[in-house]
Interface confidence: low
């Protein structure tokens, strides 16, 4: 990343796994460089942390008593460090939800996984990949959003009632595409425009529901940067 260049933004859904990508591409003269590579991930939490921050599971202790006791810019700390021999270190006990995909490393992928991502994980991340004679870096900003699906009117419906389902994710830009589906057995059946289903951006309008419409409905929001989120809602229609 060039000095002054914009830091790439990665979006993730609160409560879902998040991948913080880091796949530097370099000409390797010797495979041992990659096999013995070490990586260190650091996190600079967003300033003015959200309510969840005092209990930040990744932050170095001791935890402050109240958000106000954090400075305007929480200090950077090491989330995870994996040495050349595969030895790991970080804030102890090492959080099992913070992982490097070991199998991905055969593809030169040093991405950090948060399983799941939490609100307090938002902020700037830096990875340093240490090779024998050089170091490569990745830098990104993690933003977290909340996904929800609401029904209007809410609650149980009766046959012949109408309902509007609204699929949303707390991100400022609009999704590039919205796909609606129903779960049927092991598969997903796409919901298409029809007299029974009217699709408009992130809204699905069912003008006349029946007991057959009971069960899970889902939407997938896909954004221009490739981020997508799947949201489910269980509709109840009484006979």
């Amino acid at each position: 990343l060039q000095p002054g260049a914009e830091v790439p933004v990665v979006w993730a859904q609160e409560g879902a796994p998040a991948q913080l990508p880091c796949s530097p591409t370099i000409p390797l003269q010797d495979l041992s460089l990659l096999r013995r590579a070490g990586v260190t991930w650091q996190h600079q939490p967003d300033s003015g942390p959200p309510a969840a921050a005092p209990g930040h599971p990744l932050a170095p202790g001791p935890h402050p008593a109240a958000p106000s006791s954090w400075g305007p810019r929480p200090r950077r700390y090491t989330v995870l460090s994996v040495g050349p021999g595969g030895l790991r270190s970080g804030r102890l006990p090492l959080q099992p939800r913070v992982q490097l995909d070991e199998r991905g490393r055969q593809r030169g992928d040093f991405s950090l996984w948060l399983r799941p991502a939490r609100r307090a994980d938002a902020g700037e991340y830096r990875a340093a990949v240490h090779l024998r004679d050089r170091a490569l870096s990745c830098r990104l900003r993690l933003r977290l959003g909340q996904a929800s699906m609401t029904a209007s009117p809410p609650g149980s419906l009766r046959a012949s009632d109408w309902v509007i389902l609204n699929c949303s994710f707390s991100r400022p830009d609009r999704p590039a595409s919205v796909h609606w589906f129903r779960n049927r057995g092991q598969g997903r059946v796409p919901v298409r425009e029809s007299p029974h289903h009217h699709l408009a951006e992130s809204f699905l309008f069912l003008p006349q529901v029946s007991p057959m419409d009971s069960g899970p409905w889902g939407c997938i929001l896909t954004y221009r940067d490739g981020f997508n989120v799947s949201i489910m809602y269980n509709l109840t229609v009484l006979g």
């Epitope: 796949s23 530097p24 591409t25 370099i26 000409p27 390797l28 010797d30 495979l31 990659l34 096999r35 199998r103 055969q106 593809r107 030169g108």
Partner: antibody, heavy 121, light 107 residues
């Protein structure tokens, strides 16, 4: 030393199937992906795709989607290429190629000796 | 896909000659170009990768240069064992693509 040994030449009739094997030795099989590359008679090379030996996940080049299947038997460190519904234009030498020393990039340093597949009626 | 155009397609030279082969990429591939040597009935051997890095064990008479779209492969002083077909390949992204080859023959 690191090497890939492929199965012998095959003569097949159009419409038949063939399975080419590629046995790896000298390194940990699941630590390097396996590529397949085709060289038609008197022609250059075409990259057919890759199979990640840790997950078994294949990726095929566009023109090799459909009749071509990559598979693995990690217990014997062997990768396989199966071609079904053979056509005369499938006649070529097929190479398995490990990017053993080049995992971050798409260049190839360990090649099998090649398997000639001839399709003729 | 990125196209690699190699020239010349064939070349006659004598032992001791300096030989140069060129390769042009259809788009910028930075320095991600490899060169291979193939002898009849054999598998290719990697000589050069990342435009100018010699692979392990490759003699110093083989060299490569270039960046962006234009690349050059040079044999500084031909030896009898160098008569073969040479291929360039871009390793900038998938799918990796090869040039059509340059057959180097004895004059």
């Amino acid at each position: 030393q690191v090497q890939l040994v492929q199965s012998g030449p095959e003569l097949k009739k159009p419409g038949a199937s063939v399975k080419v094997s590629c046995k790896a030795s000298g390194y940990t099989f699941t630590e390097s992906p396996m590529n397949w590359v085709r060289q038609a008679p008197g022609q250059g090379f075409e990259w057919m795709g890759i199979i990640y030996t840790d997950t078994g996940e294949p990726t095929y080049a566009e023109e090799f989607k459909g009749r071509f299947v990559f598979s693995l038997d990690t217990s014997v460190s062997t990768a396989y290429l199966q071609i079904s519904s053979l056509k005369a234009e499938d006649t070529a030498v097929y190479f398995c190629v490990s990017d053993y020393g080049s995992i971050l990039y798409w260049y190839f340093d360990v090649w099998g000796q090649g398997t000639l597949v001839t399709v003729s009626s | 896909d990125i196209q690699m155009t190699q020239s010349p397609s064939s070349l006659s030279a004598s032992v001791g000659d300096r030989v140069t082969i060129t390769c042009k990429a259809s788009q910028d591939v930075s320095t991600a170009v490899a060169w291979y040597q193939q002898k009849p009935g054999k598998s290719p051997k990697l000589l050069i990768y990342s435009a100018s890095y010699r692979y392990t064990g490759v003699p110093s008479r083989f060299s490569g240069s270039g960046s962006g779209t234009d690349f050059t492969f040079t044999i500084s002083s031909l030896q009898p064992e160098d008569f073969a077909t040479y291929y360039c390949q871009q390793h900038y992204n998938a799918p990796p693509t090869f040039g059509q080859g340059t057959k180097l023959e004895i004059k």
